[in-house]
């Protein structure tokens, strides 16, 4: 299920990682498009162990994963994606 995620007027990620995270460890993913006070797109992965990782949007693995999730968005997603809408 795609949902809108709102956040405060600033960036959430101080730094980010390109390290691959297997889907079985991922609880949900937040996509924060550029805007709302942040001059860059951010992707935040919430892991099942309750840790949070900011992922480099240019990392190939997250791009591939997001593409798969987008293609499956008509059905129930194994990994919920939360996307903040920019007005």
């Amino acid at each position: 299920v795609l949902e809108v995620y709102y956040t405060s007027l600033r960036c959430r990620c101080v730094q980010e990682s390109s390290v691959f995270i297997p889907r079985r460890f991922i609880d949900r993913i937040q996509i924060l498009p550029r805007g709302n006070g942040c001059p860059r797109k951010e992707i935040i992965v919430w892991k099942k162990n309750k840790s949070i990782v900011c992922v480099d949007p240019q990392a190939e693995w997250i791009q591939r994963m997001m593409e798969v999730l987008r293609k499956r968005s008509s059905s129930t997603l194994p990994v919920p994606v939360f996307k903040r809408k920019i007005p």
């Epitope: 600033r10 101080v14 550029r34 805007g35 001059p39």
Partner: antibody
């Protein structure tokens, strides 16, 4: 090929107004963040303003906030900068830029248009 | 606002030299830094973003490094076409800010 063509610059008196335009082509304009960057004669670069693809998000440098308004017409592939209450320190070449996807980095630049504020 | 300071403001070098330009941020900006090249009377051109990622079409003799508050732009072997003014820019937060520029001139 990405092309950005600014127009509307010229000589204006202090306190006056001017509207700059930037005609864009060669890319999907409505999906792109756009910005204005200026450069005073013999000086460095100064970021002025930015606008999201839909036009719903806008940002300004403190030096122009309340005086300048950035806008866009996606049906015309055109970016605008309405400049009011102009001051001598606004004299500069104004560049229209297209940002890289997802980050506030000017990947493409127009040739610039000169704005001179003088009495 | 995040202040960006470049050094030196002017740099004299010869063709074939290896040159380094430094950019310092007044606060940590991780790797949210871009470098631009500008020639007289022309618009700037993007060289590097995310501190070290080369923009499309930029020669491999240009490289960037650094993280946090200190960044460098290196040209491994100066070519005649490289004599220009170079600017850094942070995009860690708004307002976006540029360094004052480094003019690279022929010795």
């Amino acid at each position: 090929e990405v092309q950005l063509l600014e127009s509307g610059g010229g000589l204006v008196q202090p306190g006056g107004s001017l509207r700059l335009s930037c005609a864009a082509s060669g890319f999907t304009f409505g999906n792109s963040w756009m910005s204005w960057v200026r450069q005073a004669p013999g000086k460095g670069l100064e970021w002025v303003s930015a606008i999201s693809g839909s036009g719903g998000s806008t940002y300004y440098a403190d030096s122009v906030k309340g005086r300048f308004t950035i806008s866009r017409d996606n049906s015309k592939n055109t970016l605008y900068l309405q400049m009011n209450s102009l001051r001598a320190e606004d004299t500069a070449v104004y560049y229209c830029t297209r940002d890289l996807p997802g980050i506030a980095v000017a990947g493409y630049w127009g040739q610039g248009t000169l704005v001179t504020v003088s009495s | 606002d995040t202040q960006m300071t470049q050094s030196p403001s002017t740099l004299s070098a010869s063709v074939g030299d290896r040159v380094t330009i430094t950019c310092r941020a007044s606060e940590g900006i991780y790797h949210w830094l871009a470098w631009y090249q500008q020639k007289p009377g022309k618009a700037p051109k993007l060289l590097i973003y995310k501190a070290s990622s080369l923009a499309s079409g930029v020669p491999s003799r240009f490289s960037g490094s650094g993280s946090g508050t200190e960044f460098t732009l290196t040209i491994s072997s100066l070519q005649p076409d490289d004599f220009a003014t170079y600017y850094c820019q942070q995009y860690s937060n708004y307002p976006l800010t540029f360094g004052g520029g480094t003019k690279l001139e022929i010795k």
